[in-house]
Interface confidence: medium
C-alpha cells in the first residue's frame, strides 16, 4: 500500500501520527500554548495522499496560528472597553455598568491561552424581572429582552463561532433559567483541566448526594438530589476505540474511566457500571445487567481486558450505536424491573462519552439521546435520573455542536468538554469527584480540590483545650467521639473546663464543644519509669472524649476512618471476612510509609513511618538523647512497641501543640488514621508566636529530629473496650 | 557578644599542609555547627564543609574530601581545619563561619590568608 | 550539587535608586515550609556579613531598607534606596542539603 508524503511540518510546530505514514493514519497537529495549529489535522487516504478534513485544497501549509477570543458583540446598559475586533492571548476587557444598574460577574476579564475568557459573564442587572437577567456571553447575541416567568431568550454565535450550552432558555417558577449559560468559543478552543474538573466534579457530585460547592445561598438556585447510600446509579462509560485514536491515547481513555471506576466506588453509593467500546460497532464489555456490574474489581478488569485490537476491521466512528447500545440496556432493565416499579424508576443514570471525534457514520447520536430521555420518562421533575457527560479530547476533529447537543444542559452546571489532550483528560479524571460532601458519618473523606480549605481536606482534625494551658489536637473518629493523648491531660481529670473545637461550614473559627467524658488510658504514667533514669515515658499515651452533643456532618466536619473497622473495610474496600491484621497489612505496608499529620496552621504535613529494621535504626537515635534519658541502656525501655517512628529524611516533625492529632494515610481516595502524635525530640516551632512558622532542626541538632506516634494497631484492645458500641470492630 | 577569631596568615609550599584555628566565644560552643568557606583573591565564596562540635560529625564539599579536616577542641572551645596536599590554586582567605539555627552563616571569623608558593 | 546563579555580575545604581539582584537555583531550595536561601554583604578586606536569611528575613541589625523575596528556584535580594555604604559584593547561599552552594556574587557600585 502506498505511504502518505513526509514533507508535512508545522512551523513552529511538531506534529505525531496515530499509524506512521501508512493510509488510516492521522496526522495531529500541535503548537505552543498560546498558537493553535491551521490545520488541525489530516488523514492519509488510502490513495497515499493526505486530506485535510474541511478543507478545499488538498494540501494547504500548516502554520501555527495566534489564538484570539472573542469580542463582545453586544452588551447592555453599559460599556466595555477596549473595543476590539477579537483580543488577543493575556488581553484584557473591562465592562462598567450605565446608573441604577449593578454589575453581576466578571468586571475584567482576560484572554487565556486555550481560547477562552476567564472569569464569568459581566452583565448590568437593575433586578426588575422575575428572573435575574441572563445575559450575553461574549461573542454571542441575544434576542429576547423580557424576564418574566415563562419568557423566553435566544442565543446565536456571531461569525464562525460556536455556540455550546442552551441556544434556548426559558425563565422558571422558581427564578432560575432553564439549560445552562451558552458561550461563544472560537472551533479551535479547549478547555483546561482545571476548569473541568471542578465543572464536571460539581455536576456529578450532585448525583452522588452532594450540593454543589459554588452555589449561592438562595436556596431554590441549582439542583439539589440525594442519592441516599440506599439508592442506585447506573454509570456507563462509552469509549471511542475509532481509527482516529491512537494506541496509546486509548491506554489513556481507558487509565482514566479506572480513575473514574474508584472514584464512583469509594462513594459507598450502591453504582453498576457499563463499560462500552466503539468504533464503526459497539462492544459492550460490561453490562449494568451483569452482577459484576456492582463489583469495583470485576469492572476494573473488564476495563483492562478493553482491546485496542477488538476494533480494527471497523474503525469509524459510529457514536449513535454506541449511545444506543445504552439504551438497549435500559430496555432490558426496565423490562427486568418493571416500568412502574420503584426499583427502576429510583435508578439515576449518569452516561460519560469519550470521544475524539465526530460520528461519521450510524445516524444522528441525538436520536438515541431522545430515546433514552423517553424510555427514561425524563422531564422537568425527572430531569435529575439522567446526565450525559460528552467529553471530546484531542481539539482535531471534535465537532462543538455536536458534543454540546449530546450533553445535558442543567442550569450552574456543564456536560460538554473539550480537552486539549488525552493526558488532560487523566488530570480531570484524578481530581473530578470530591465525596466530601455528603452529609451521613462515612469516614476518612477528605476535599482533596486544589482550592479547598485545610478543614476541608482533614474534616476530623478538631482542636482540645484544655483549661488555658497549651492546646493539643485530635480526630473525630465518630459523630460523638474524639481521640488523642493522654498526656494533654495530666492535670487531673476535671473536665468542665476543657472546649473541643470541631470544623463548622459556618465559622472559619470552628464550633465548640463540652465534654461529656472523657476516657484517659490507665496505664498512662510519664514518670513510670523515673527510677530507671527514664524521666518521661509515654507508653500508652492514648484518651478519648466523648463531646457533650452529636457533631452535625458537614464538609467541614467528619470522621476519620479507623483501621480494624467494618467502617473502614468498606472503605478500603476489602472483602468480608477480612481481619484487623489485614488492615495492618495493607496499610502499614512498606519499610517506609508515607503519612501525614496536621500542622498548628491546619495544613497537612508529611512524613514517613518507619516500619521492620527501618524502625529499629529510627528509634535508636533516642539513646543519644542525653537530658530526657541520661542512663538509658536499651531503647526499648522508652520507645516500645506500641509506638511508630517518624523524624528521618525530609519528615516533618510534629510541634508541641500538635499532640493527640492524627498520623493519617490515604488510600483509594480515602483515610485512614494508623497512629496519634505523642511526643519527640524536636519541637520545630519552639520560640515562634507564629502559627505558619516552624523550621526544621538545625544541622548542628544532636540527636537529629525522631518522633514517636502511638499504633493503633497495638491499642485494639483498650479501643475495643471504649467503643465497641460506637464502631464495628473487625476480628484482629 | 558572639566573637570567632581565627590564627594568622600561612605561608606554605606545595605539597604541604595547613591547620587554621578558629576560637569561639559568646556562646555555648557545642550548640552551634562551625563551617569553613574559602575565597581565592577577586573570586567568590566557596564552602569547604562543617563540624557539629558535640558530636564531632563532619560534612564534607566533595571537592575537599580526603585533603580537608575538621577538628574540634571543646575544651577550649576552638575549630580546626587542615588542608593538606596544597596547591597554588589553594591561595585563598580561609574563613570559618557559625551556622544559626536556620543554617546560615551569621557570625564569621576575620579570615587567614593562607599562600601556595614554591 | 544545587548551583547557583546571581544577575547580573555587577551592576551601577544611582544613589537613592532601587537595586534589584537575583539569584536562580538549579534545584528547589524549599523544605519544610521554608526557602533556605540566604543573602550575604561583602566588602573588600571584610568577611561576609549575613543580610537576610531564610529568602525573605531581615537579620536583627540590617537596615530595612534591604529585603528578600522568592521561593522554590528564583530570589531577589532588594535594596529599596541606595545609600554610599550599600556598595558591595553580594552572595546568595543555600542550605538545603549538603553541599552548601553560593553563587557566583553581584558587585554593586554606585553610579
Known amino acids: 500500500a502506498p505511504s502518505c508524503p513526509q514533507n508535512v511540518n508545522i512551523s513552529g510546530g511538531t506534529f505525531t501520527l496515530s499509524h506512521g505514514w501508512a493510509p488510516g493514519s492521522l496526522l495531529t497537529y500541535s503548537c505552543p500554548q498560546g498558537l493553535y495549529p491551521s490545520p488541525a489535522s489530516r488523514l492519509c487516504k488510502s490513495s497515499g495522499q493526505w486530506q485535510t478534513p474541511g478543507a478545499t485544497r488538498s494540501l494547504s501549509k500548516a502554520v501555527c496560528k495566534p489564538v484570539r477570543c472573542p469580542a463582545p458583540v453586544s452588551f447592555e446598559n453599559g460599556i466595555y472597553t477596549p473595543r476590539l475586533g477579537s483580543y488577543p492571548v493575556g488581553g484584557n476587557v473591562s465592562f462598567e455598568c450605565e446608573d441604577g444598574f449593578i454589575l453581576r460577574g466578571s468586571p475584567v476579564r482576560q484572554c487565556r491561552p486555550n481560547g477562552m475568557w476567564d472569569g464569568e459573564t459581566a452583565v448590568c442587572d437593575n433586578g426588575a424581572g422575575h428572573c435575574p437577567n441572563p445575559g450575553i456571553s461574549l461573542g454571542a447575541v441575544r434576542t429576547g429582552f423580557r424576564f418574566g416567568h415563562g419568557d423566553k431568550v435566544r442565543y446565536r454565535c456571531s461569525s464562525n463561532l460556536v455556540l455550546t450550552g442552551s441556544s434556548e432558555r426559558e425563565c422558571q417558577g422558581n427564578g432560575v433559567w432553564s439549560g445552562t449559560e451558552p458561550i461563544c468559543r472560537q472551533p479551535y478552543s479547549y478547555d483546561f483541566p482545571e476548569d473541568v474538573a471542578p465543572a464536571l466534579g460539581t455536576s456529578f457530585s450532585h448525583m452522588l448526594g452532594a450540593t454543589n460547592p459554588t452555589q449561592k445561598t438562595k436556596e431554590s438556585l441549582g439542583r439539589k438530589i440525594q442519592i441516599q447510600r440506599s439508592g442506585h446509579l447506573n454509570l456507563y462509560l462509552l469509549l471511542d476505540c475509532s481509527q482516529s485514536v491512537s494506541e496509546n491515547d486509548f491506554l489513556i481513555f481507558k487509565e482514566s474511566a479506572s480513575l473514574m471506576v474508584d472514584r464512583i466506588f469509594s462513594f459507598e453509593i450502591n453504582v453498576s457500571v457499563a463499560i462500552i467500546t466503539f468504533a464503526s460497532e459497539p462492544k459492550v464489555l460490561m453490562s449494568v445487567l451483569n452482577d459484576n456490574s456492582r463489583d469495583m474489581t470485576e469492572v476494573i478488569s473488564s476495563l483492562e481486558n478493553a482491546n485496542y485490537k477488538d476494533h480494527e476491521n471497523g474503525t469509524g466512528t459510529n457514536t449513535y450505536a454506541a449511545l444506543n447500545s445504552v439504551y438497549l440496556m435500559m430496555n432490558n432493565q426496565m423490562r427486568l424491573l418493571g416500568m412502574e416499579t420503584m426499583a427502576w424508576q429510583e435508578i439515576r443514570h449518569a452516561i460519560i462519552l469519550l470521544t475524539d471525534g465526530k460520528s461519521n457514520m450510524g445516524g444522528s447520536p441525538k436520536t438515541a439521546v431522545d430515546h433514552i430521555r423517553e424510555i427514561l420518562n425524563i422531564n422537568q421533575k425527572r430531569n435529575d435520573y439522567l446526565d450525559i457527560y460528552a467529553i471530546g479530547v484531542g481539539k482535531l476533529d471534535v465537532d462543538w455542536r455536536e458534543l454540546n447537543e449530546l450533553g445535558s444542559k442543567k442550569d450552574g452546571e456543564r456536560h460538554a468538554f473539550i480537552l486539549q489532550d488525552t493526558k488532560a483528560l487523566h488530570q480531570v479524571f484524578e481530581h473530578m469527584l470530591d465525596v466530601s460532601k455528603l452529609t451521613d458519618t462515612i469516614c476518612g473523606v477528605g476535599n482533596m480540590s486544589a482550592n479547598a480549605s485545610d478543614q476541608e481536606r482533614t474534616p476530623w482534625h478538631v482542636t482540645i483545650k484544655p483549661k488555658s494551658q497549651e492546646t493539643c489536637r485530635g480526630a473525630l473518629i465518630s459523630d460523638q467521639w474524639v481521640l488523642t493523648a493522654a498526656h494533654c491531660f495530666r492535670d487531673g481529670n476535671d473536665h468542665s473546663l476543657w472546649r473541643v473545637n470541631v470544623g463548622d461550614p459556618k465559622s472559619q473559627w470552628g464550633k465548640e464543644f463540652l465534654i461529656e467524658k472523657a476516657v484517659i488510658s490507665p496505664g498512662f504514667d510519664v514518670f513510670a519509669k523515673k527510677n530507671q533514669g527514664i524521666l518521661e515515658f509515654y507508653g500508652d499515651d492514648i484518651a478519648l472524649l466523648k463531646l457533650a452533643q452529636k457533631v452535625k456532618m458537614s464538609t467541614h466536619a467528619r470522621p476519620i476512618c479507623l483501621p480494624c473497622t467494618m467502617e473502614a473495610n468498606l472503605a478500603l474496600r476489602r472483602p468480608q471476612g477480612s481481619t484487623c491484621r489485614d488492615h495492618e497489612n495493607e496499610l502499614l505496608n512498606k519499610q517506609s510509609v508515607p503519612a501525614h499529620f496536621v500542622a498548628l496552621n491546619g495544613s497537612k504535613l508529611n512524613i514517613n513511618l518507619k516500619m521492620g529494621v527501618e524502625w529499629t535504626s529510627c528509634a535508636e537515635v533516642v539513646s543519644q538523647e542525653k537530658t530526657m534519658f541520661p542512663n538509658l541502656t536499651d531503647v526499648r525501655e522508652v520507645v516500645t512497641d506500641q509506638f511508630l517512628c517518624s523524624g528521618t529524611q525530609e519528615d516533618e516533625s510534629p510541634c508541641k501543640g500538635e499532640s493527640g492529632g492524627a498520623v493519617f494515610l490515604e488510600r483509594r481516595f480515602r483515610f485512614f488514621q494508623v497512629g496519634l502524635v505523642s511526643w519527640g525530640l524536636y519541637n520545630p516551632c519552639l520560640g515562634s508566636a507564629d502559627k505558619n512558622s516552624r523550621k526544621r532542626a538545625p544541622r548542628s541538632k544532636v540527636p537529629p529530629p525522631r518522633d514517636f506516634h502511638i499504633n493503633l494497631f497495638r491499642m485494639q484492645p483498650w479501643l475495643r473496650q471504649h467503643l465497641g458500641d460506637v464502631l464495628n470492630f473487625l476480628p484482629l | 557578644e558572639v566573637q570567632l577569631v581565627q590564627s594568622g596568615a600561612e605561608v606554605k609550599k606545595p605539597g604541604a599542609s595547613v591547620k587554621v584555628s578558629c576560637k569561639a566565644s559568646g556562646y555555648t560552643f557545642t550548640d552551634y555547627n562551625m563551617d569553613w568557606v574559602r575565597q581565592a583573591t577577586g573570586q567568590g565564596l566557596e564552602w569547604i564543609g562543617d563540624?557539629?562540635?558535640?558530636?564531632?560529625?563532619?560534612g564534607y564539599n566533595q571537592k575537599f574530601k580526603g585533603r580537608a579536616t575538621m577538628t574540634v577542641n571543646k575544651s577550649i572551645s576552638t575549630a580546626y581545619m587542615e588542608l593538606s596536599s596544597l596547591r597554588s590554586e589553594d591561595t585563598a582567605v580561609y574563613y570559618c563561619?557559625?551556622?544559626?539555627?536556620?543554617?546560615?552563616?551569621?557570625?564569621w571569623g576575620q579570615g587567614t590568608l593562607v599562600t601556595v608558593s614554591s | 550539587d544545587n548551583v547557583l546563579t546571581q544577575s547580573p555580575d555587577s551592576l551601577a545604581v544611582s544613589l537613592g535608586e532601587r537595586a534589584t539582584i537575583s539569584c536562580r537555583a538549579s534545584?528547589?531550595?524549599?523544605?519544610?515550609?521554608?526557602?533556605?536561601m540566604h543573602w550575604y554583604q561583602q566588602k573588600p578586606g571584610q568577611p561576609p556579613k549575613l543580610l537576610i536569611y531564610?529568602?525573605?528575613n531581615l537579620k536583627s541589625g540590617v537596615p530595612d531598607r534591604f529585603s528578600g523575596s522568592g521561593s522554590g528556584t528564583d530570589f531577589t535580594l532588594t535594596i529599596s534606596s541606595l545609600q554610599a555604604e550599600d556598595a558591595a559584593t553580594y552572595y546568595c547561599q543555600h542550605s538545603r542539603e549538603l553541599p552548601y552552594t553560593f553563587g557566583q556574587g553581584t558587585k554593586l557600585e554606585i553610579k
Open positions: 531564610l529568602a525573605s
Open positions: 534545584k528547589s531550595v524549599r523544605t519544610s515550609g521554608y526557602n533556605y
Open positions: 563540624i557539629n562540635p558535640n558530636y564531632e560529625s563532619t
Open positions: 563561619a557559625r551556622e544559626d539555627d536556620h543554617d546560615a552563616f551569621a557570625y
